[in-house]
Amino acid sequence: EVEKTACPSGKKAPEIDESLIFYKKWELEACVDAALLATQMDRVNAIPFTYEQLDVLKHKLDELYPQGYPESVIQHLGYLFLKMSPEDIRKWNVTSLETLKALLEVNKGHEMSPQVATLIDRFVKGRGQLDKDTLDTLTAFYPGYLCSLSPEELSSVPPSSIWAVRPQDLDTCDPRQLDVLYPKARLAFQNMNGSEYFVKIQSFLGGAPTEDLKALSQQNVSMDLATFMKLRTDAVLPLTVAEVQKLLGPHVEGLKAEERHRPVRDWILRQRQDDLDTLGLGLQGGIPNGYLVLDLSMQEALS
């Protein structure tokens, strides 16, 4: 906290300019008018203040706006944003995407801080949903943003926003998140033709049910092994050898290298060895010939 002292003669700041970098903290406190600072916030970002000097400028704004800063000030905070606490940010009402972009730009290249997380939360809650433009912006700055949301939060993403999602945005998503996103993607891309549809839907397939995988197997999609390995085990298990062969196309040979890993390992255990042998890959561990396969899940459903 900087003591209240009178401004020395001739040091009262008529405007926010670079001469202020020579001011000590107490001089900034005494000689810079808070209302002037608020109207000339855009200049602060171009002046190489020290971190300590920014503390004083923040303190002046806090005194001027105890209920939270107006958006006209927030948009021009620049590096002063790094001084804000999540508690400060919770007082704000940020509605403009331009304001959001300006503040994310300040934090660019760094991990998502608690301040940024709070800002995004306030912004999205203010909008009521995660619309396409917002999602576009957030994933541009934080490719992992989507996967940081809970399945409940993801449920507020409208299908139209899915067009903004890039494959790398889903890299860290877990199956529960993809379960929520996949139906939205399916809806968003439903009017695309087969090959274009597959390109778009591919990164969401970790949430696809068995029936959709069966449908894809009829469309010559040639799914790569990396995508196949991310599919839900429970969705892969009911697929026949013929369906998996059609689904993977020329990539089917990759099954051999993955035969000890899920979901391939579990899928192999469910197939007849005879059927696996038709692939000519030397996959082992299928059900020996002559054994009766009981579908216990079906039996449980009937009882």
Partner: nanobody, 116 residues
Framework: QVQLVESGGGLVQAGGSLRLSCTAS????????MGWYRQEAPGKERELVA????????NYADSVKGRFTISRDNAKNTVYLQMNSLKSEDTGVYYC?????????WGQGTQVTVSS
């Protein structure tokens, strides 16, 4: 991150002179706007004493005007602070800084002690 290394500090009698140097590891050094700061004691505020921009234009704190001169040698990636007529109140650790908004990295500093 650009490394800044300050040197040239030491113990000097009041009225004496010292020349501080700050060398940067960055090749695009000539484009940088540079400043020298003084910190009287640990925990106290760093005060800006002099700046020099890319065109060689300089500015000084009132307390050092006429006594200190800041200069630069872009070929050597170095900025200097020539300190004459030193006073006991000039004692402190001197740091150079790349005067870039949002840049708050400092070198290790060089101690200047002026005895009266």
């Amino acid at each position: 991150q650009v490394q800044l290394v300050e040197s040239g500090g030491g113990l000097v009698q009041a009225g004496g002179s010292l020349r501080l140097s700050c060398t940067a590891s960055e090749s695009g050094f000539s484009a940088n706007y540079m400043g020298w700061y003084r910190q009287e004691a640990p925990g106290k505020e760093r005060e800006l004493v002099a700046t020099i921009n890319r065109f060689g234009s300089t500015n000084y704190a009132d307390s050092v005007k006429g006594r200190f001169t800041i200069s630069r040698d872009n070929a050597k990636n170095t900025v200097y602070l020539q300190m004459n007529s030193l006073k006991s109140e000039d004692t402190g650790v001197y740091y150079c800084r790349i005067m870039r908004p949002g840049n708050w990295y400092w070198g290790q500093g060089t101690q200047v002690t002026v005895s009266s």
